[in-house]
Amino acid sequence: SITGISPITESLASLSTYNDQSITFALEDESYEIYVEDLKKDKKKDKVLLSYYESQHPSSESGDGVDGKMLMVTLSPTKDFWLQANNKEHSVELHKCEKPLPDQAFFVLHNRSFNCVSFECKTDPGVFIGVKDNHLALIKVDYSENLGSENILFKLSEILEHHHHHH
């Protein structure tokens, strides 16, 4: 369970892949699409509000046996919209929702490979946000393998402005 209903901290950042492609968000037909693309030099990077929560996660709740205090994150690129895991479709989607947010909007934060991070689905341990065919997708990672595979690694570049909301 999330130990507190309010985040311990928040920050505004742009999100890019390990290979420095930008994660961008576009409003199309009243819904948001998520793209992974090379940005033109003069184009401004899209911002994401990252809200960090603590979670006490007993091992009985997860298949991977991970037990203890986890740092979880929600990602919101625009007001009232959050990234969510769709485990059935193995997809990452933007949905409008109200608080309290559903579990599908929470991701366990992994610090990886110096200053990269990975996002593991709270609802599906061992499944991470990753890049597939220039889109974000859910990717199953075998825990016996090294979690450092580049397609699940992301870089956060903090944007130094007040984070009360954006777009």
């Epitope: 901290t9 920050s11 960090y52 996660h57 203890g68 366990v108 934060l109 490979s113 450092g148």
Partner: antibody
Framework: QVQLVESGGGVVQPGRSLRLSCAAS????????LHWVRQSPGKGLEWVAL????????YYADSVKGRFTISRDNSKNTLYLQMNSLRPEDTAGYFC???????????????WGQGTLVTVSS | DIQMTQSPSSVSASVGDRVTITCRAS??????LAWYQQKPGKAPNLLIY???SLQSGVPSRFSGSGSGTDFTLTISSLQPEDFATYYC?????????FGPGTKVDIK
């Protein structure tokens, strides 16, 4: 309660090797990243190395890279630091420390061992 | 590597005093800063993490604030057991780095 107990320190000549151990209890050892941090006598704290909860990722301070190796045995709840090619400047108390969060180092270190002293001198 | 500086390097205070220690990072570290207390011959003890979150079991007279590059640890009413050295540590960027410490001693 959480306990971390280091051992293996001692006096060693420059160029020689030493292996430190840290026995852990009171928490799910295999769920947490673990660190070695050192403190020279009368000085401040210096982070040395980190191993991820599953042992798949290891990171080192530049000052020890290529000489020190961090490892863990999750079946024995034990963390290790193999120190080779020791130098006088490696003289310090060595602490093992547990990450506050399972998979993230953002929270710092919530539990520390009592330390073991390593003296490198001819 | 991110350099951490602390001020003052030492402070003399009396029981009941309000003590403030500042920590500055050479570049922005968001809120990922921890504070530790260390007594002679002992291991450091985590007081505050994420700049302002009080670690379980730590008395509420300890508080932390700040984000970006400037941070503060405040002891609202110094107790006899608080005389120690205090270190800040940035946990945002690799490698983790510590401040040089602030020694709080008896006036």
């Amino acid at each position: 309660q959480v306990q971390l107990v280091e051992s293996g320190g001692g006096v060693v000549q420059p160029g020689r090797s030493l292996r430190l151990s840290c026995a852990a209890s009171g928490f799910t050892f295999s769920s947490y990243g673990l660190h070695w941090v050192r403190q020279s006598p009368g000085k401040g704290l210096e982070w040395v190395a980190l191993i991820s909860y599953d042992g798949s990722n290891k990171y080192y301070a530049d000052s020890v890279k290529g000489r020190f190796t961090i490892s863990r045995d999750n079946s024995k709840n034990t963390l290790y630091l193999q120190m080779n090619s020791l130098r006088p400047e490696d003289t310090a108390g060595y602490f093992c420390a547990k990450s506050l969060y399972t998979t993230s180092w953002y929270g710092g270190f919530d539990y520390w061992g009592q330390g073991t002293l390593v003296t490198v001198s001819s | 590597d991110i350099q951490m500086t602390q001020s003052p390097s030492s402070v003399s205070a009396s029981v009941g005093d309000r003590v403030t220690i500042t920590c500055r990072a050479s570049q922005g570290i968001r809120s990922w800063l921890a504070w530790y207390q260390q007594k002679p011959g002992k291991a450091p003890n985590l007081l505050i993490y994420a700049a302002s979150s009080l670690q379980s079991g730590v008395p509420s007279r300890f508080s932390g604030s700040g984000s970006g590059t400037d941070f503060t640890l405040t002891i609202s009413s110094l107790q006899p057991e608080d005389f120690a050295t205090y270190y800040c540590q940035q946990a945002n960027s690799f490698p983790p780095t510590f401040g040089p410490g602030t020694k709080v001693d008896i006036k």
